[in-house]
């Protein structure tokens, strides 16, 4: 039985040219996280974090994606095209798969500051 929940940073905004942290957190379960997949809205892969092997960064993003903090991702040099949904998929044992969603809006305005408030989707 899957008892856990994924908490995410929810809807966030950040400045064009800046960076943002995409973060998910699995709680309320003792399941072991074996792998985390990070993907964009169109199912294109950003990165995979394997508990034993480390990080696999999709080559097209290697100059703009930094691993961490933790199981999260830092997306750098943001463009307007980065606006959209991001998904974290937690592969766990013995629970199975958990999935979280983050919506990132990239703004021209210098007012935009991203919030690190965690939400349960």
């Amino acid at each position: 039985m899957m008892t856990g929940t994924i908490e995410t940073t929810g809807n966030i905004s950040a400045k064009k040219g800046g960076s943002v942290i995409l973060q998910c957190h699995l709680s309320s379960t003792m399941a072991q996280v074996t792998q985390v997949n990070w993907e964009q809205h169109d199912h294109s892969l950003l990165a995979i974090r394997n508990a034993e092997l480390g990080w696999h960064i999709y080559p097209a993003f290697k100059d703009r994606v930094a691993p961490g903090p933790g199981l999260g991702l830092t997306l750098q040099s943001l463009t307007m095209n980065d606006t959209g949904e991001y998904f974290c998929t937690y592969h766990t044992y013995p629970d199975g798969t958990y999935r979280g969603r983050i919506f990132l809006e990239v703004l021209e305005s210098s007012v935009a500051e991203h919030s690190a408030r965690f939400q349960i989707p």
């Epitope: 995979i48 394997n50 092997l53 480390g54 960064i57 080559p59």
Partner: antibody, heavy 127, light 107 residues
């Protein structure tokens, strides 16, 4: 020497679930530096990668099939399995399992070639 | 996804002739390009990994070259047993992809 052997029904009815198993012999599926793949080949066509599983359960599926695919692993039996839901005639193909190797170091890892393949099993979707 | 385009689709060659098969990637894949040989009713057999590294037991007439987006598999002095379909494969990016294949026929 590691060998892979696919098994499962050769005939599946439309809308049902295709289920195949790959048995690994001559080596452990729990080796850290390998990932385990399913690939298919439609009649007279090229190779299409379906997805992979790592021994500890991590997966990645081809986006074109992911809504219908589940790959699982049973380390106690040295096997990994493919389930493909809601099949149609377009899923008629030869299905292969294959071992891929992994390079890792410095906190990063990379996917290498697929060095060992099963003989393949033909699955026909028909009523 | 990275698209691999092989050319030609088909090649009819006389024994002892030289064969060159090209594989072009839609974006740079570095050296993460591998070649497989598939004979009728058989599973693919690994030939070359990482552009130019031959697998154990592969005859020396098979060689590979290239980098980035353009790669070539060369068969020097083709033999009758080389009649097969050849596939390139990239492991740089997920989803993993294969070229469409090049069928080599012996005249």
């Amino acid at each position: 020497q590691v060998q892979l052997q696919e098994s499962g029904p050769g005939l599946v009815k439309p809308s049902q679930t295709l289920s195949l198993t790959c048995t690994v012999s001559g080596g452990s599926i729990s080796s850290v530096y390998f990932y385990w793949n399913w690939i298919r080949q439609h009649p007279g066509k090229g190779l299409e990668w379906i997805g992979y599983i790592y021994y500890s359960g991590g997966t990645y599926y081809n986006p074109s099939l992911r809504s219908r695919v589940t790959i699982s692993v049973d380390t106690s039996k040295n096997q990994f399995s493919l389930k493909l839901n809601s099949v149609t005639a377009a899923d008629t193909a030869v299905y292969y399992c294959a071992r891929g190797s992994i390079a890792a170091g410095g906190g990063y890892f990379y996917y290498n070639d697929m060095d060992v393949w099963g003989q393949g099993t033909t699955v026909t979707v028909s009523s | 996804e990275i698209v691999l385009t092989q050319s030609p689709d088909f090649q009819s060659v006389t024994p002892k002739e030289k064969v060159a098969i090209t594989c072009r990637a839609s974006q740079s894949i570095g050296s993460s390009l591998h070649w497989y040989q598939q004979k009728p009713d058989q599973s693919p057999k690994p030939l070359i990994k990482y552009v130019s590294q031959s697998f154990s037991g592969v005859p020396s007439r098979f060689s590979g070259s290239g980098s980035g987006t353009d790669f070539t598999l060369t068969i020097n002095s083709l033999e009758a047993e080389d009649a097969a379909t050849y596939y390139c494969h990239q492991s740089s990016s997920l989803p993993l992809t294969f070229g469409g294949g090049t069928k080599v026929e012996i005249k």
